[in-house]
Interface confidence: low
């Protein structure tokens, strides 16, 4: 019996087609992915084919304006057009609470939404029965799926779930939701999450009876043989995990932002055991037509952003790179402009000692979510800032001594290379990493701005000093693993909208073309 | 038990309208397309409109298109065929069928596998 | 005039083997797959087989469907006296932009 698994993940908003680098489309004809073009391409492979499930992964929510102006409902109502089997919860469906979560999307949803283990307490605990479950049984032809979900237990480091909810640990959660599944005699099971290529394989190797894992978070690539687009694959797809009890397990992930379409083919025996397993990644570009209906629908729901983000703030004359694989991993121009626009916001000239009261930015890469194309007529909207920084956070004043910053930088590439999120772009500090030592013990330099100093130049780093430090809210609070600036802060003062800081600093520039200049260095 | 129990039928004039009706149950009624069938006495099945789970792709057969409309109300569990400018060549036995997808266009791999017992419309003078 | 075209009618007898065939065009058969439907006299249509070969359950495995090109086939085997009805193959047709079903083949068991 043979089943095909479409699946995607991290479509994080792209409802519309995008370029080639997942920002905002410019030209129509190179442009690629879009809720419009995976529906044709989805039903294809359901004409074509009996056993069809389409999988979501997780983080619909957030990225583009798409989500800042419906918060949710799009997701819904497109996914249900497009008549998704499922989804797993992602951390970002959690960006505007579990409110946010349970209105738009889990009251609105007419597919299961899935995870094993997160458990509901206190008060929620009744109010969000049954609107999200550990798993589905699915028909498929003649036959029966089970469907598992599970979400980072990080969650509550990425998001923002409130305390009635618990995040357990994937494996340990999701066992006995397998074994309940087996107990009623489903023999063909799917795990379906967002945590991460390394957990997903985890899973794979230790959850007995998961015939398969399909997963996201990672932005994961995998792909057999020559690759489409410009992503690198992490490997072949299906990447296959032997269990510790001596199956083999593919595992797969369709990298992000609705670009691919993974297809897997999935040949089960009677006993529901997995005999065979192929298929890639398909890439969602130009050559595959939009739905007529769905782009129709898309352009009803596009009037309401059109009037809110479209007029033009000011100009870029360079490229603003705010790739994940750029600014995950080295510095980037689109980091260094906003924590130019975040110091500019802060300009208190407070005496004739101090040129300002604060010199310094970070600002983690993973919360910068799109490039800007230069090539519109280098034209920067704030619907392109809000593909850039789409969690409507604030840019907060912070005072840290020395030595938690040491700690924040050291954390910053304490598993530096898997493209997670806590990489610092930086303003007014000069750092120099040395990777070849152990975790922990990577910061070689770091300079910083003077701000008691008429002519600004760098100097090292005191531990023992206070500083002033301007950073996300998502930082202050601990995000992105950063426990140690939300335990050893000494003063927390809230800032303004991130977008606005941006938009602002923009508009007062009127031409910009910030450089990559030397401010994060490898030894 | 899932049910299709079409009403509506009857002997109409030439020229005149009739509205069938088709009550759904046993089913997520919203969770697929919907069609009307018909069949004229001793001949074949004609498919005459189709429409999907949403209302968002609708389609007819050349012999009804510009006379007759096809319509759902999901809160109802209903689907509807108006039927305008109605022709002798009309007549049949009308039938109302479930699809095993949701949408209307091209996903012809889905079948019809609920149909209703039909309901019968003349048209004669 | 009907775009996909069957045999009026076909005949065999109980236990052997028959064949029903459908024939129509690029724009129906051959760019999209096929369903069949029987209908027992006096009774409403039930579908027989979806995406050329699949059965919904219920279907009897004696029941098989296949398609080659611009045409389809019904093979029913082990006959059956029970099996004596009209079937309908049908297809979606691109340049009618709708649901076409064939003539019909009224299918008689003999003896």
């Known amino acids: 019996w043979e089943l095909t698994i479409l699946h995607t993940n991290d479509v994080h908003s792209r409802l519309e087609q995008t370029s080639e680098d997942s920002s905002k489309c410019v030209n129509a004809s190179r442009c690629m992915g879009g809720v419009a073009r995976l529906f044709t391409k989805v039903q294809q492979i359901r004409r074509a084919e009996p056993n069809v499930l389409l999988l979501d992964a997780g983080d619909q929510y957030q990225g583009t304006i798409w989500f800042t102006v419906y918060k949710g409902a799009e997701v819904a109502h497109f996914m249900n057009a497009l008549r998704y089997d499922a989804m797993a919860l992602g951390n970002h469906e959690f960006d505007n609470g579990v409110e946010g979560l349970i209105e738009p999307l889990l009251k609105e949803a007419k597919f299961p939404i899935l995870s094993a283990n997160i458990k509901a307490k206190g008060p929620l605990a009744s109010q969000i029965s049954g609107l999200y479950l550990p798993y589905k049984v699915l028909p498929v032809g003649d036959e029966v799926v089970g469907i598992v979900g599970y979400t980072s237990k990080e969650t509550p480091f990425l998001s923002n779930p409130g305390t009635n909810l618990v995040f357990e640990d994937e494996i340990t959660a999701l066992q006995p939701e397998v074994d309940k599944l087996k107990t009623l005699n489903v023999n063909k099971i799917i795990a379906l999450g967002h945590s991460g290529f390394e957990t997903d394989k985890l899973i794979a190797q230790k959850v007995r009876g998961v015939d398969v894992v399909v997963g996201g978070h990672s932005n994961t690539f995998l792909y057999t043989g020559n690759p489409p687009s410009k992503e690198v694959p992490a490997g072949k797809y299906p990447f296959i995990v032997t269990s510790d009890d001596g199956r083999k397990v593919p595992v797969v992930q369709a990298y992000a932002f609705g670009k691919y379409l993974g297809y897997l083919k999935i040949e089960f025996d009677e006993r529901g055991n997995v005999i065979s397993s192929h298929g890639n990644p398909i890439l969602l570009n130009s050559s595959i037509p939009e739905d007529p209906s769905i782009k129709a629908d898309i352009n009803k729901w596009r009037i309401k952003l059109d009037n809110y983000s479209t007029q033009e703030l000011g100009k870029t004359i360079v490229y603003l790179d705010g790739s994940s694989q750029s600014c995950r991993f080295r510095e980037c121009n689109m980091g260094n402009l906003i924590c130019d626009a975040m110091i500019n916001n802060n300009l208190r000239h407070a005496d004739e000692m101090f040129w300002n009261h604060v010199s310094m930015c970070i600002l983690n890469g993973g919360g910068i979510r799109s490039p800007i194309d230069e090539r519109n007529n280098g034209t920067i909207t704030w619907e392109n800032l809000a593909a850039v920084l789409p969690f409507g956070g604030t840019f907060d004043l912070v005072q840290l001594k020395g030595s938690t910053l040491k700690k924040a930088f050291e954390h910053s590439v304490h598993r530096y290379g898997q493209s997670t999120g806590e990489f610092l772009q930086v303003g007014g500090i000069h750092v120099v990493y040395d990777l070849s030592r152990k975790p922990g013990d990577r910061v070689v330099k770091l300079d910083v701005l003077c701000t008691k100093c008429r002519v600004p130049s760098y100097d090292p780093l005191k531990m023992d000093e206070i500083y002033k430090v301007i950073l996300p809210n998502f930082l202050a609070n601990g995000g992105d693993g950063f426990q140690m600036i939300k335990d050893e802060l000494l003063r927390h003062d809230s800032g303004d909208q991130d977008i606005n800081v941006v938009s602002t600093y923009i508009s007062k520039m009127k031409v910009i073309y910030p450089a990559v200049e030397g401010r994060i260095k490898f030894s | 038990e899932v049910q299709l129990v079409e009403s509506g039928g009857g002997l109409v004039q030439p020229g005149r309208s009739l509205r069938l009706s088709c009550a759904a149950s046993?089913?997520?009624?919203?969770?697929?397309?919907m069609h009307w069938v018909r069949q004229a006495p001793g001949k074949g099945l004609e498919w005459v409109s189709g429409?999907?789970?949403?209302?968002?792709?609708?389609g007819y057969a050349d012999s009804v298109r510009g006379r007759f409309t096809i319509s759902r109300d999901n809160a109802k569990n209903s689907l509807y065929l108006q039927m305008n400018s109605l022709r002798a060549e009309d007549t049949a036995l009308y039938y109302c069928?479930?699809?095993?997808?949701?949408?209307?266009?091209?996903?012809?791999?889905?079948?019809?596998?609920?149909w209703g017992q039909g309901t019968t419309v003349t048209v004669s003078s | 005039q009907t775009v996909v075209t069957q045999e009026p009618s076909a005949s065999g007898t109980p236990g052997q083997r028959v064949t029903i065939s459908c024939s129509g065009s690029?724009?129906?058969?051959?760019?999209?797959?096929v369903n069949w439907y029987q209908q027992l006299p006096g009774t409403a249509p039930k579908l027989l087989i979806y995406?050329?070969?699949q059965r919904p359950s219920g279907v009897p495995d004696r029941f098989s469907g296949s398609k080659s090109g611009i045409s389809a086939s019904l093979a029913i085997s082990g006959l059956q006296s029970e099996d004596e009805a009209d079937y309908y193959c049908?297809?979606?047709?691109?340049?009618?932009?709708?649901?076409?079903f064939g003539g019909g083949t009224k299918l008689t068991v003999l003896g």
């Open positions: 069928a479930k699809d095993m997808g949701w949408e209307l266009l091209k996903t012809s791999y889905y079948g019809m596998d609920v």
């Open positions: 046993g089913f997520t009624f919203d969770d697929y397309a």
């Open positions: 429409i999907s789970w949403n209302s968002n792709s609708i």
């Open positions: 690029s724009s129906n058969i051959g760019g999209n797959t």
């Open positions: 995406s050329n070969n």
């Open positions: 049908a297809a979606w047709d691109d340049s009618l932009n709708g649901r076409v």
